[in-house]
């Protein structure tokens, strides 16, 4: 009797199905809608999880300003096709026939067109930009104290090497944190900066993926920080191709 | 990046013997743990053996305990499964796989194409 069997959870990832079934009684974990292996050790990929949830029951400093080529991700949710190591499939399609281009958050970076569209590659996302907006607090937070607080936040809860965190800006109410990660800099074994943007993003809502933690509770110096508004902004390394009419819409 | 290439799969009556064996390249072979994998037409993945790095460590399943042996060659990058006193239930697509163990859970990361293994009676 190992304490694998005694706690077969992943604690990284609430929406798996976990069985003491592995090599020497291990806990074996796979994550809802695609059954595939997931690794608890560390987060799991933003397109196994946005499988499982669409799989589970329906329920003077200055800011930083998005580039004309940022995307946001507007079309909200849906069962995508991931490959076998769990990354997004450059191209996505719903039931209809609709298929269109995404990047490695999943965010859709083409118009949408008919099976016969084609996505030659995967584009990376390298730079994400959060932008917070924060409840009314006494005064405004000292800027160093909360930029070491979300440094510390994404390299202790989320497992992001801090040299991918390349900026975090205040101007109150706004915060806007900058994550930064080339093809060429992310190693073997190092998160990827759009899975710990997704679960920074469904902590801030109240929705951790984490197992059996509490929610997130964001403080400097003591000082709750409350979120009130997140935008999200992606940026990848090739520019995304709609077309002039979806621009000037 | 990282391949696997099975073969040695094929069509074995019951109570046949079949080697599988799987090429590595794209990471350090000689210090991964690695694992066979098979899966049967409308079923889940289900492990069938485990090898540490340097191969002083196996695991197996008890369906499969006895009649199957993993074993490697970090000298040629290559997996091994020998697989004996086969059953109509053995018949699946085998894979291997880099594998992880840790105290309390086990994984695999990547899985090569897989080779088909049918058993007839």
């Known amino acids: 009797h190992t304490a694998a069997q005694d706690n077969c959870t992943c604690p990284t990832n609430k929406m798996t199905v976990c069985s003491p079934d592995g090599p020497g009684g291990r806990c074996q974990c796979r994550a809802l809608g695609s059954g595939m292996a997931v690794d608890c050790s560390t987060l799991t990929s933003k397109c196994l999880l946005l499988k499982a949830r669409m799989s589970a029951p329906k329920n003077a400093r200055t800011l930083v300003r998005p580039s004309e080529h940022a995307l946001v991700d507007n079309d909200g949710l849906y069962d995508p096709d991931c490959d076998p190591e769990g990354r997004f499939k450059a191209r996505q399609c719903n039931q209809t026939s609709v298929c269109w281009c995404v990047n490695s958050v999943g965010v859709r970076r083409t118009d949408k067109g008919d099976l016969s569209l084609r996505c030659d590659e995967l584009v990376r996302t390298h730079h994400i930009l959060i932008d917070l907006r924060h409840r009314p607090t006494a005064g405004a937070f000292n800027h160093s104290d909360l930029d070491a607080e979300l440094r510390r936040l994404f390299r202790e809860r989320y497992r992001l090497h801090p040299k991918f965190v390349a900026a975090v800006h205040y101007e109150q109410p706004t915060i806007q944190i900058e994550l930064r990660q080339n093809t060429s800099q992310k190693a073997a074994g190092d998160v990827d900066i759009g899975d710990a943007a997704y679960y920074f993003e469904r902590d801030i809502k109240g929705e951790s993926l984490f197992q059996g933690r509490g929610g997130l509770d964001l403080r400097v110096r003591g000082e709750p920080l409350q979120v009130e508004r997140t935008l999200i902004y992606y940026l990848d390394e090739i520019p995304p191709k709609f077309s002039m009419k979806r621009l000037t819409a | 990046q990282v391949q696997l290439q099975e073969s040695g799969g094929g069509m074995v009556q019951v109570g046949g013997s079949l080697r599988l064996s799987c090429a590595a390249s794209?990471?350090?072979?000689?210090?991964?743990?690695m694992s066979w994998v098979r899966q049967a037409p409308g079923k889940g993945p289900e492990w069938v053996s485990y090898?540490?790095?340097?191969?002083?460590?196996?695991y197996y399943p008890d369906t499969v305990k006895g009649r199957f042996t993993i074993s490697r060659d970090n000298a040629k990058n290559t997996l091994y499964l020998q697989m004996n006193s086969l059953k109509p239930e053995d018949t699946a697509v085998y894979r291997c796989?880099?594998?992880?163990?840790?105290?309390?859970?086990?994984?695999?990361?990547?899985w090569g194409q897989g080779t088909q293994v049918t058993v007839s009676s």
């Open positions: 090898i540490n790095a340097d191969g002083s460590k196996t």
């Open positions: 794209g990471f350090p072979f000689s210090s991964a743990d």
């Open positions: 796989a880099r594998a992880k163990l840790t105290d309390t859970h086990y994984v695999e990361d990547y």
